[in-house]
Amino acid sequence: KSPIFGPEEVNSVEGNSVSITCYYPPTSVNRHTRKYWCRQGARGGCITLISSEGYVSSKYAGRANLTNFPENGTFVVNIAQLSQDDSGRYKCGLGINSRGLSFDVSLEVSQGPGLLNDTKVYTVDLGRTVTINCPFKTENAQKRKSLYKQIGLYPVLVIDSSGYVNPNYTGRIRLDIQGTGQLLFSVVINQLRLSDAGQYLCQAGDDSNSNKKNADLQVLKPEPELVYEDLRGSVTFHCALGPEVANVAKFLCRQSSGENCDVVVNTLGKRAPAFEGRILLNPQDKDGSFSVVITGLRKEDAGRYLCGAHSDGQLQEGSPIQAWQLFVNEESTIPRSPTVVKGVAGSSVAVLCPYNRKESKSIKYWCLWEGAQNGRCPLLVDSEGWVKAQYEGRLSLLEEPGNGTFTVILNQLTSRDAGFYWCLTNGDTLWRTTVEIKIIEGEPNLKVPGNVTAVLGETLKVPCHFPCKFSSYEKYWCKWNNTGCQALPSQDEGPSKAFVNCDENSRLVSLTLNLVTRADEGWYWCGVKQGHFYGETAAVYVAVEERKAAGSRDVSLAKADAAPDEKVLDSGFREIENKAIQDPRLFAEEKAVADTRDQADGSRASVDSGSSEEQGGSSRHHHHHH
């Protein structure tokens, strides 16, 4: 499929000008290659009319130009003094005309309307309001006022001052007669339809002395704004319909076959299942404008979108609308990353978030998508050291591996963590990605004690048992704080006896805290990594208390406190479930790897409807030793 994009149809009138914008992926090669505008012949060729290399056909001499905007990835063809001969099929493209890197454009130039003398032309957008002004003389001040529409050869009464209203205009038309000082009446038509366009005649009086005025009403269907975005990227539709519809329900819909327009999202709470987790409707301003953001763009998202206002929250005849034609460029600069990450309850996930590598200094954010109230995304963690209180000790955002990717680790998973999360930065807003976390059944990999109590001034040793499957991975202990997890020295104690059917490659790695102080209290994580790619983690809360009896503490799994909701195994080991599906590069041997398929079927893990304040549920005070 060609990555070139432009307007499918361009309509104009004889004597006018058009400006046609064509989009291309702004790679270095594309920015500098030839751009052209050619006319398609009946036998399939395409004859160049103008190109970026300076060629201008004699047909276009003095009335056309082509300008390249390499920084935007666009070029613009301007054509003036249009005639009906210019109607036809064209291509805008890159390189050689026959190469296929092009987009088909249909140009339709029509004759200007043949208007009667003294005809007032009203040009109004679909769904808006028009006021047709009708002057009259004093002798007709007391006589009947009327507005007719020319249908074929016959004038059809639309409205008159005796109270008649044509059924096609019921509820959306009125006739106003100005005060005695002004010899003028006006007809106001709201919620204009395409079918309202045409020739009108207003009249004061019915005899030969009546005053008449011709009006030509042109109702414009909005030209779609062209939007060119990358696959897996995001798009923002800014919808400004005017203050007159500030209090009317708003919608965004996508045109399907024919005139149908399927609601994508509206302010009445409707949302299409295909957009679950990847759409947010920003609340409207006082002037009634609003915006809709869609992330994780898919090929099938391409098409025509309309935003509008109607009490039903969907497109109806006479809705004021704005239109966009979205093209999804499959030659995307945004790398693939898992759209679904699975983790076992009690375990952890490590989510990779892509960002524009030119913006390495931007602030990175990770937020929880909430579908209620048209969508919010409350911040959970950022790269500046802020962590939502309910997530202390179990959530960390790491700048690693860097170079266009950051990592978010969430551990102590519960079923309430299932849901959609967004990766954002304060830089390039096109780089917003969505990941769904699913909580699955399974067994843990890492085994650590429950909450541990250390004694001031003594030595504490905390074990972490790694199964043999992690033999080739780097094993670490770190102390969590709101800016990350600071690595600590640890000791390899040899093979672990905590696993059945696991050979000598299993490992017991201990964290030793010498001469414990109050500052040692807090969350500690053990985990695995490979270079800068993080795998599973398990968390332990270490509480510090006053000395009771001398000596050092060597915490075994059996002696550790079993926290609520965690199972104690028959062997005496307490197991914190800790299997997570991570970056496929890390855990290629695992069967269920992060699922990168688009989840358009609506089969997603359920998210508790509790508020975001309740999410998490694993903050420090829950884990103190009593």
Epitope: L280, N282, P283, V293, Y365, C367, R376, C377, P378, L379, D382, E384, G385, W386, V387, K388, A389, L424, N426, T429, N482, T483
Partner: nanobody, 131 residues
């Protein structure tokens, strides 16, 4: 809701120092940025300094860089503004402001220097610098 109470204002000579405090109470777990703004009579309210509540990154208006220092004590839910080398042009009402963590996409675009980014405001404390 978050309530903010400023203190520490007063009348000083040019070149002197002053330390303003702002104590936050209420739902302080939602705090994201805290900042100081000032408003001289007949002037617009202007940004002075801000601090990120998590990592402590600081932001300053060019006019106070090198003279003013913003700091925080998370345990006390308090933010401070240490003002050194005060000038008569620093005379104004000083307001403490708090911003909660972003929730809507537009929130993420707002900068700590923007007055519109802040959700909660104190009553202000007067600082007068005489020459």
């Amino acid at each position: 809701q978050v309530q903010l109470v400023e203190s520490g204002g007063g009348l000083v000579q040019a070149g002197d120092s002053l330390r303003l405090s702002c104590a936050a109470s209420g739902r302080t777990s939602s705090l994201y940025n805290m900042g100081w703004f000032r408003q001289a009579p007949g002037q617009e309210r202007e940004f002075v300094a801000a601090i990120h509540w998590g990592g402590g990154r600081t932001y300053y208006a060019d006019s106070v860089k090198g003279r003013f220092t913003i700091s925080r004590d998370n345990a006390k839910n308090t933010v401070y503004l240490q003002m050194n080398s005060l000038e008569p042009g620093d005379t104004a009402n000083y307001y403490c402001a708090a911003r909660r963590a972003p929730e809507l996409l537009d929130d993420y675009k707002q900068k700590p220097e923007e007055i519109g980014a802040y959700h909660y405001w104190g009553q202000g404390t007067q600082v007068t610098v005489s020459s």
